[in-house]
């Protein structure tokens, strides 16, 4: 196995929930076999670790939720990589393996006495972020009846309960945004549309759903093309020339694309002088990302995009922005992160990093350039889902009893899954969180429009919403020219 | 976990090799979550179990191969299903998990004494058959540096060593048959070709390779279509009408398809009266299968197909056909298989199955309707590869020593992988077995042609071969009309 000793964040409790967050970036290609991860991440990593710790504190301080039961956690780093996440998941299930080893008499003591374990089993797992990684993790967890609740894995494949029975998510399947895109096309009577998608699961399955739904609505997908996100200029130019050949009839280009594919298209438009010739309709790979449009705003103007609805969680910032390395000792990655974030050395600290010359001064604060993780609400909702599922299970198995009764020792993953699937509660954004028969959550999207707001000033503005099948659009805003 | 107690075939030895064979069919949809498998299988199951047991006997009795070391095995049932195979693979790695548990002090004895284990670790795994299942298994095994040698998993994805480092195979990647198909197209100067593929990894990646290679050779893939194997008549008819619309220019249809997709096309040709209009070029999903052409021979005439080269292994039949349920007790599935094969009850036997009314009589023999598993040679070559890899490793780590020296206790999976990748030996069919840098074996295919051999008598005949890039064709045979 990897020589890397894996760090874990623990919080004690009567019931332990596992979590997989990408605390570090993926291993680089040359480090893949050692499973040696990249640099520490703030949004997708440290913020999610802190969200888990703080949300559990909130749950544990709530007399109405799991009274007399404390929830603890074991947080592990997935590094946004299947092999690492799988290795970490094996740690989650180790306990189940060992208990069955003992049943089978494969672990014995020299004198014949019985052995005991010093670690509580994990009852469920939150995460990981990536769909492809979540699939691998689910393949393993479902063998042990361990429910998994994802906070950003949106692939349609994961809706298949024959394959992924113990998988649930507080985000919608990408099929929902395909539906939203079709509804926009319908609303504006665009009957003849070109289509582009990024090679890979996200783009391919998304575009397939878009095409199927379009066909049912009598929308003609005139021509359909695919391209790799990292394709060269030549490939993008070739694609743009094909799209140009279908003008003016197919002016609308539906793009189920990763952000960098959209950027490649915009750059090709610039090279071929095609700014303003197309109206792009983009999926949430584009959303409201500035790294997609930077330097190519003129080409992007008019673009309509889909964005998952998830407002900032203000109370998380209240907690997070006060954290300091000298007091936040329960997060084992925090000192490493602090030094990386401020490019300085924490002198005299356990994890002092000598690669930084400058010493960290005490006036540093996380408020500087703070951006909350865009998926924060989903992460917290996933944790709450697990708590409410356990709460409902306790209510039904231990009526009139506060705490863990014998019927909940050990926790039966099948019963927990049933309880989780029936869970509904008010999520952090005020929306109802609930799960359909596939363990998916309702689709709630904002419709964004990229506009020229003033001379050389461009921005995304919210022009509508799509909530579980209902499209609302501010048509005047979509079609109005710039607000000078 | 599943309430099913998993049966295992064991053979003791100094070194234990794991194997995954589809001893039973996949679980039906309603049994998937219990991972309750289907009926017992002869070719893909029982024959492979017996091949492993007998091949290890041959190896152990060979004084030139691993002298003073006996190879044993632990054979598990994959049921041609990812979840079952993964569950079984966890059993293979359990030992590694427990030994590290002990290092970490997570398993302790009540009186503080040390615990011991009663099971040898697995050094490598043979199988499983299916690519998608092999991928899942590899994801797990590589975390523990356990080499895996596959005997029929041909997906191109598995060549990616950044993803699947510990995976090797004695069969070629499907990229090779795509190359073979392109070489046939080139040979006959077919410059304008239609293409069809089955939805799913096999068809999609195969067709993608075929298209890429065709483009480089200046072959125009006029139109490309995909279809599900289980698509309805309407879908097949629609596809055939599209193909018809490109006649006569695109008469050749290259089909990277599963057998049942080809059958669907043949049936649609009958319905639309298109027999003889196309020349089909099929991948090894069609090969020389009669279940593809039965009842639709006229439509299939002229078809050229690719088939993996694998002659029968005569010495295996010598062993296998003599097996009887009263004496073959080491194969735990054999009695179940015997009763299933002859639809009778083994009275007084441990696994007597009361669902059969008829009692098995003693004159029954496996010779009746015997067909050797078409992949038998590959299964045996995979086992030999493991043995030769271990042999070479022993020679380099224990020079001048017969048996397992300390340097091989425990066996280091990384070193074993290196040794396996350098292995080359003469396989059961007399061909050289060796592995390229991706752990793949050379491509050796037979080119088959489906012909009318006489009035209403049709068959596949061998009209050529493709051996590691070299195409040989008997052109006269291909283009001659039927031999009446």
């Amino acid at each position: 196995q990897s020589s890397e000793r894996r760090v874990v964040a623990h919080m004690p409790g009567d019931i332990i929930i596992g979590a997989l967050f990408s605390v570090h970036h993926q291993p680089t290609v040359d480090k893949v076999h050692e499973r040696k991860c990249g640099a520490v991440r703030e949004q997708y990593g440290i913020q999610r670790v802190e969200a888990m710790l703080h949300t559990l504190e909130r749950i544990n301080s709530d007399p109405t939720l799991l009274p007399n039961i404390t929830l603890g956690c074991e947080i592990r780093d997935s590094c946004w990589h299947s092999a690492v996440a799988l290795e970490q998941s094996i740690e989650f299930i180790r306990d189940s393996l060992i208990s069955s080893e003992e049943e089978e008499g494969l672990v014995r003591c020299v004198d014949g006495s019985s052995s005991f374990r010093s670690k509580k089993p994990i009852v469920g797992v939150i995460g990981p972020g990536s769909s492809s990684v979540a699939i691998q993790v689910q393949n393993l967890l479902q063998l042990f009846n361990i429910p998994q609740i994802a906070y950003s894995a949106t692939s349609m494949d994961l809706s298949d309960k024959t394959l992924f029975k113990y998988f649930m998510r507080v985000v919608p399947s990408d099929a929902q945004q395909a539906r939203a895109m079709v509804d926009i096309v319908k609303r504006y009577n665009w009957t003849y549309v070109s289509a582009v998608h990024t090679e890979g699961n996200y783009g391919e399955s998304g575009m397939e759903a878009f095409k199927d739904m379009s066909a049912k609505e009598g929308i003609c997908i005139a021509h359909s093309y695919k391209i790799y996100s990292n394709a060269g200029e030549q490939s993008f130019d070739k694609l743009l020339k094909k799209l140009r050949s279908h003008l003016p009839k197919a002016r609308v280009v539906a793009c189920f694309c990763e952000g960098m594919t959209v950027r490649g298209l915009l750059m090709a438009m610039r090279r071929l002088g095609l700014a303003g010739e197309f109206l792009l309709l983009g999926s949430d790979g584009w959303a409201d990302r500035y790294d997609v449009t930077d330097g190519y705003q003129r080409e992007a103007v008019g673009g309509i995009t889909i964005k998952l609805q998830s407002p900032d969680v203000k109370w998380f910032d209240d907690y997070y922005l006060k954290l300091r390395p000298e007091t936040n000792l329960r997060n084992p990655w925090f000192q490493e992160f602090w030094q990386h974030r401020f490019q300085c050395r924490l002198e005299g600290f356990a994890q002092e990093n000598s690669k930084y010359n400058k010493t960290c001064n005490s006036s540093l604060t996380l408020r500087t350039h703070h951006v909350q993780d865009s998926k924060m609400g989903f992460v917290i909702n996933a944790i709450y889902s697990m708590a409410y599922g356990l709460h409902n299970m306790q209510m039904s198995l231990c009526p009139g009893y506060a705490g863990l009764c014998d019927a909940m020792k050990p926790i039966d993953g099948r019963k927990l899954l049933d309880s989780l699937m029936k869970t509904n509660f008010t999520g952090v954004s005020g929306d109802m969180i609930l799960f359909d028969e596939n363990g998916d959550s309702p689709g709630r999207y904002e419709i964004m429009n990229f506009k020229e707001m003033g001379k050389d000033y461009f921005d995304y503005i919210n022009v509508g919403s799509w909530d579980n099948g209902e499209l609302k659009m501010d048509d005047d805003e979509v079609w109005s020219k710039k607000n000078n | 976990q599943s309430s099913e107690r998993r049966v295992v075939a064991h053979m003791p030895g100094d070194i234990i090799i794991g194997a995954l064979f589809s001893v039973h069919h996949q679980p039906t949809v309603d049994k998937v979550h219990e991972r309750k498998c289907g009926a017992v299988r002869e070719q893909y199951g029982i024959q492979r179990v017996e091949a492993m047991l007998h091949t290890l006997e041959r190896i152990n009795s060979d004084p030139t191969l691993l002298p003073n070391i006996t190879l044993g095995c632990e054979i598990r049932d994959s049921c041609w299903h990812s979840a079952v195979a993964l569950e079984q693979s966890i059993e293979f790695i359990r030992d590694s998990l427990i030994s590290s548990e002990e290092e970490e002090g997570l398993v302790r004895c009540v009186d503080g004494s040390s615990s011991f284990r009663s099971k040898k670790p697995i050094v490598g795994v043979i199988g499983p058959g299916s690519s998608s299942v092999a991928i899942q298994v590899q994801n797990l095994l590589q975390l523990f540096n356990i080499p895996q040698i596959a005997y029929s998993a041909t997906s191109m994805d598995l060549s990616d060593k950044t993803l699947f480092k510990y995976f090797m195979r004695v069969v070629p990647s499907d990229a090779q048959q795509a190359r073979a198909m392109v070489d046939i197209v080139k040979r006959y100067n077919w410059t304008y070709v239609s293409a069809v593929h089955t939805e799913g990894n096999y068809g999609e990646s195969g067709m993608e390779a075929f298209k890429d290679m065709s483009a480089k050779e200046g072959i125009c893939i006029a139109h490309s279509y995909k279809i599900y194997s289980n698509a309805g008549e309407q879908s097949f008819d629609k596809l055939l009408k599209k193909l018809r619309s490109h006649l006569p220019k695109a008469r050749v249809v290259a089909c990277f398809c599963e057998g049942m997709t080809v059958r669907g096309l043949l049936m649609a040709m009958r319905r639309l009266g298109l027999a003889g209009e196309f020349l089909l070029l099929g991948s090894d999903g069609w090969a020389d299968r009669y279940d593809v052409t039965d009842g639709y021979q006229r439509e299939a005439v002229g078809g050229i197909t690719i088939k993996l080269q694998s002659p029968d292994v005569k010495w295996f039949d010598d062993y296998y056909l003599k097996l009887r349920p009263e004496t073959n007790l080491r194969n735990p599935w054999f009695q179940e298989f015997w009763q299933h094969r002859f639809q009778c009850r083994l009275e007084g036997f441990a696994q007597e199955n009361s669902k059969y009314n008829k009692t098995c009589n003693s004159s029954l023999t496996l010779r009746t309707h015997h067909v050797q598993d078409s992949k038998m040679g590959f299964v045996i070559n995979a086992i030999y590869s493991m043995a030769y890899g271990l042999h070479n490793m022993q020679m380099s780590l224990c020079p001048g020593y017969a048996g397992l020296c300390d340097a091989m206790k425990p066996i280091d999976g990384r070193k074993l992988l290196d040794s396996l990748m350098k292995t080359n030996f003469t396989g059961v069919s007399g061909d050289m077995i060796l592995f390229d840098e991706n752990g793949d074996s050379p491509g050796r295919y037979e080119i088959m042609n489906f012909k009318e051999m006489g009035k209403d008598y049709f068959d596949y005949i061998n009209v050529g071969s493709w051996d590691n890039g070299e195409l040989k064709m008997d052109d006269d045979e291909v283009w001659s009309k039927k031999n009446n």
Epitope: N60, S61, K322, N328, T426, S429, G430 | -
Partner: antibody, heavy 121, light 110 residues
Framework: QEQLEESGGDLVKPEGSLTLTCTAS?????????MCWVRQAPGKGLEWIAC????????YYANWVNGRFTISRSTSLNTVTLQVTSLTAADTATYFC???FGVGGYSFNLWGQGTLVTVSS | AYDMTQTPASVEVAVGGTVTIKCQAS??????LSWYQQKPGQRPKLLIY???TLASGVSSRFKGSGSGTEYSLSISGMECDDAATYYC????????????FGGGTEVVVK
């Protein structure tokens, strides 16, 4: 059961200082709570002053506080204190200690009975 | 800053009647809204949190609703004992705020 009790309210001269104490019983600060101070001037509404997170000691103040109020906690004594300096007549109010709970964001499910602070010369 | 505007400042309602109090936030508070009842000389009492969840032991005659920036509290079947001042409070953040409470609504029962 869970209870909060404020003490330290008094008649103080303008520009004077005061320390108010909130003692918790029935629950422990070693768990995680936002403990807050809220005041209410005679005949007026509720006005939030400050909160402290018991597990980390992080503090939060209303924008108008301007450094005149300091909140702190003692985990061992299970107390939260509010130090008030440079008092003026506008600070005359009943000062309540409140505990925020769990999933309701900052929702105060437990209040003390209040302690009266009068600023007068 | 999150300013909470409560209307009306006072209201009279007959016994058995229904009263609705509104609370508007200056920006979305994601349903992190609580309602309190305070009687003269007493401490405030939590009625509702998360916009619509009834606190333990509170009568179902009290009903909270709303989302985003607009919230309301309805009390049906008014009883004399419901005479009190009612406050809304945003619970989404305690950073960069002047006051988390609304100005209060005095409810007089006739």
């Amino acid at each position: 059961q869970e209870q909060l009790e404020e003490s330290g309210g008094d008649l103080v001269k303008p520009e004077g200082s005061l320390t108010l104490t909130c003692t918790a019983s029935g629950f422990s600060f070693s768990n995680y709570y936002y403990m807050c101070w809220v005041r209410q001037a005679p005949g007026k509404g509720l006005e939030w002053i400050a909160c402290i997170y018991t597990s980390s000691g992080s503090t939060y103040y209303a924008n108008w506080v301007n450094g005149r109020f300091t909140i702190s906690r003692s985990t061992s004594l299970n107390t939260v204190t509010l130090q008030v300096t440079s008092l003026t007549a506008a600070d005359t109010a009943t000062y309540f200690c409140a505990k925020s709970f769990g999933v309701g964001g900052y929702s105060f499910n437990l209040w003390g009975q209040g302690t009266l602070v009068t600023v007068s010369s | 800053a999150y300013d909470m505007t409560q209307t009306p400042a006072s209201v009279e309602v007959a016994v058995g009647g229904t009263v609705t109090i509104k609370c508007q936030a200056s920006q979305s508070i994601s349903s992190y809204l609580s309602w309190y009842q305070q009687k003269p000389g007493q401490r405030p009492k939590l009625l509702i949190y998360r916009a619509s969840t009834l606190a333990s032991g509170v009568s179902s005659r009290f009903k909270g609703s709303g989302s985003g920036t607009e919230y309301s509290l309805s009390i049906s079947g008014m009883e004399c004992d419901d005479a009190a001042t009612y406050y809304c409070q945003q619970g989404t953040t305690i950073s960069d705020v002047d006051n988390v409470f609304g100005g209060g609504t005095e409810v007089v029962v006739k």
